[in-house]
Amino acid sequence: LPAQVAFTPYAPEPGSTCRLREYYDQTAQMCCSKCSPGQHAKVFCTKTSDTVCDSCEDSTYTQLWNWVPECLSCGSRCSSDQVETQACTREQNRICTCRPGWYCALSKQEGCRLCAPLRKCRPGFGVARPGTETSDVVCKPCAPGTFSNTTSSTDICRPHQICNVVAIPGNASMDAVCTSTSPTRSMAPGAVHLPQPVSTRSQHTQPTPEPSTAPSTSFLLPMGPSPPAEGSTGD
């Protein structure tokens, strides 16, 4: 026969734990229901009555199943120089992120502690990995046959155009120049951009910084500033 399903509140068997979305109330010595995200415990359970839950008030939230007496306060409104990427709701705190072109170099409990400008890759270098909300751009030298002639935090290395007759060969920072006869194949005009991520939350491990024009954030590391990478522009 199937075991009888116990309804909360119930006394757990000795040595066993309460089920998912239940908690053990020390006072009542019973397994009781947790409140769902967006709610909090208005009245704790007793031996004869289950937890009474109530909705979080405005500007407060609970993100997890819980039995807290009061919901958590949402963080203060995003300052004018930050972007609200997640609003305060009954189930989630607001999230403020750095303005476009900047990333969070140092975080704190309530959000970002220090925003820093995204590294810009210099001519001859393209974006190997785009910046996210919490990680800087990684630049790489343009491989033979490719170039970047911009200082940008979004442009990747583009292939040289292929000429019937080359007037000036391309290099890492300049496209090939063809003679007046048209090239057999040319790339679409304009720089190739990598889209700026809006809500990437992952923190990448940073390889050694490549040449760039953005200021180094190495001052944030415990070991102190390191010398600029070869070919990078100093402050």
Epitope: C104, L106, L114, C115, A214, T233
Partner: antibody
Framework: QVQLVQSGPEVKKPGASVKVSCKAS????????INWVRQAPGQGLEWMGW????????KYAEKFQGRVTLTVDTSSSTAYMELSSLRSEDTATYFC????????????WGQGTLVTVSS | DIQMTQSPSSLSASVGDRVTITCKAS??????VAWYQQKPGQSPKLLIY???TRHTGVPSRFSGSGSGTDYTLTISSLQPEDVATYYC?????????FGGGTKLEIK
């Protein structure tokens, strides 16, 4: 309202140390970085360093590295700036200033503390 | 470190005049520029951040503009209470650095 109140003026001899305090009120002290900026008489403003009260994490300007120590006492919401091996050129008004958010500009300043170094 | 070169170092103007103070950064600072007003014997007061955003409570006669390396603070109609030294500051990179200041007097 948000306020930073600094300790009174100090007169010190060359080679001595000075410790200036900055008491915060009207906001959550541990949530905002406190910076120290100095101004020599008739001169411009010079950033010295910062401290994050929640973790005690510090960063100093290269010029002051090894001579300046920033600390906090979270129980009294007070930040301290200690400058050692004083010389006459350290005669200046020292300001504490708060970062309003994650960018390095200062929205609230203390009234300043004049430190005079003279033999 | 990024250098901020402010000009002029001092200027004298009449009440009602339009006053312009300029600041040049040694490299592109992407509008990460703040302006402060410091009256004699007082601490600096934030006027403008992000080159053109007025701080809370700052009168509308104060405005900021600029991009790249060149930034300007403008007082559209000078008032007697505007007598002060004005400083620009970049916060694009650490350490934050200030201009040398512009001392503004009334003629």
């Amino acid at each position: 309202q948000v306020q930073l109140v600094q300790s009174g003026p100090e007169v010190k001899k060359p080679g001595a140390s000075v410790k200036v305090s900055c008491k915060a009120s009207g906001y959550s002290f541990t949530s905002y970085d406190i910076n120290w900026v100095r101004q020599a008489p008739g001169q411009g403003l010079e950033w010295m360093g910062w401290i994050y009260p929640r973790e005690g994490d510090t960063k100093y300007a290269e010029k002051f590295q090894g001579r300046v120590t920033l600390t906090v006492d979270t129980s009294s919401s007070t930040a301290y700036m200690e400058l050692s091996s004083l010389r006459s050129e350290d005669t200046a008004t020292y300001f504490c200033a708060r970062l309003t958010g994650p960018y390095w500009y200062f929205d609230v300043w203390g009234q300043g503390t004049l430190v005079t170094v003279s033999s | 470190d990024i250098q901020m070169t402010q000009s002029p170092s001092s200027l004298s103007a009449s009440v009602g005049d339009r006053v312009t103070i300029t600041c040049k950064a040694s490299q592109d600072v992407d509008t990460a520029v703040a302006w402060y007003q410091q009256k004699p014997g007082q601490s600096p007061k934030l006027l403008i951040y992000w080159a053109s955003t007025r701080h809370t409570g700052v009168p509308s006669r104060f405005s900021g503009s600029g991009s790249g390396t060149d930034y300007t603070l403008t007082i559209s109609s000078l008032q007697p209470e505007d007598v002060a030294t004005y400083y620009c500051q970049q916060y694009y990179s650490v350490p934050p650095t200030f201009g040398g200041g512009t001392k503004l007097e009334i003629k």
